[in-house]
């Protein structure tokens, strides 16, 4: 089968600081040297790009400076962290992996991770 399988957890709960981490693992049908990883958010039928990074196998994953994502890679596994999340960002986050080089190109799309974000309660004013 020439398809690429991508696995990611079904559910992740963001921390009280609005940080969510999950692993995206892909089964590569070829020996890729250049890989692109994209996090997509699906809400209803709308799909938007959250962040994307291209990396050379063996090197670190580098997102743009203004990205809300960070990540590390190890073999066919990518550890992704999304920060700055708020309750309104709760939703399905899809890991998309593309083997960009060498040919042929392969596309892999995970089933998505439902990230739940709960805004922290504001601290009550304390009198001293």
């Amino acid at each position: 089968c020439k398809a690429m399988h991508v696995a990611q957890p079904a559910v992740v709960l963001a921390s009280s600081r609005g940080i969510a981490s999950f692993v995206c693992e892909y089964a590569s049908p070829g020996k890729a040297t250049e890989v692109r990883v994209t996090v997509l958010r699906q809400a209803d039928s709308q799909v938007t790009e959250v962040c994307a990074a291209t990396y050379m196998m063996g090197n670190e994953l580098t997102f743009l400076d203004d990205s809300i994502c960070t990540g590390t890679s190890s073999g066919n596994q990518v550890n992704l962290t999304i920060q700055g999340l708020r309750a309104m960002d709760t939703g399905l986050y899809i890991c998309k992996v593309e083997l960009m080089y060498p040919p042929p190109y392969y596309l892999g799309i995970g089933n998505g991770t439902q990230i739940y974000v709960i805004d922290p309660e504001p601290c009550p004013d304390s009198d001293f």
């Epitope: 398809a3 997509l40 790009e49 998309k96 190109y105």
Partner: antibody, heavy 118, light 108 residues
């Protein structure tokens, strides 16, 4: 709204060259892969080439390798197809098509006709 | 290269009838990477279904897709006059991306 407009088609003699353009608007051009797909008169769809994101990764169908070059200018939101050593069998309507974030081709231009004839 | 075969080549039906179009792949295609397009004369193709079964934006629910592995189906539950067209399947999971030869749905 997303719009793709092809131009540059016409009648050309075998062995000659032609450059097609596709002007894109209504989306962040550099975030999407872009394709050329062609359709010979009365025939089905044939994928020709794709170019990804920054433009360094390109793939072609075997029949055009070494003759056609796909490129993009993200600053101008424009996709190109340089066609050299044209043959009669390259006669077709050429469409540019955007790659949806999940992979299929979600938006297509209206097409531009290329006729290779002596 | 993944070769896609479509059947039948032509389907002659009346408005209101159900249309069942088949697409078969030469090797297994993940259902995540199979699409269906509609094309009318003189027009560009239009994306109908992606991921084998997800309807594209604005596509009416009379269009549905199913299948996995090497066998996929596009079903039009009740044909409307505007549905008479040519339908193509496509795999986009690996290059070269390939289209089937098409099925023409015409009026009986």
């Amino acid at each position: 709204q997303v719009q793709l407009v092809e131009s540059g088609g016409g009648v050309v003699q075998p062995g000659r060259s032609l450059r097609l353009s596709c002007a894109a608007s209504g989306f962040t051009f550099s975030s999407y892969g872009m394709n050329w797909v062609r359709q010979a008169p009365g025939k089905g769809l044939e994928w020709v080439a794709v170019i990804w994101y920054g433009g360094s990764n390109k793939y072609y169908t075997d029949s055009v390798k070494g003759r056609f070059t796909i490129s993009r200018d993200n600053s101008k939101n424009t996709l190109y197809l340089q066609m050299n050593s044209l043959r009669a069998e390259d006669t077709a309507v050429y469409y540019c098509a955007r790659v949806h974030l999940l992979g299929p081709f979600d938006y297509w231009g209206q097409g531009t006709l290329v006729t290779v004839s002596s | 290269e993944i070769v896609l075969t479509q059947s039948p080549g032509t389907l002659s039906l009346s408005p209101g009838e159900r249309a069942t179009l088949s697409c078969r792949a030469s090797q297994s295609v993940s259902s995540s990477y199979l699409a269906w397009y509609q094309q009318k004369p003189g027009q560009a193709p239009r994306l109908l279904i992606y991921g084998a079964s997800s309807r594209a934006t604005g596509i009416p629910d009379r269009f549905s897709g199913s299948g996995s592995g090497t066998d996929f189906t596009l079903t039009i539950s009740r044909l409307e006059p505007e549905d008479f067209a040519v339908y193509y399947c496509q795999q986009y999971g690996s290059s070269p991306f390939t289209f089937g030869p098409g099925t023409k749905v015409d009026i009986k």
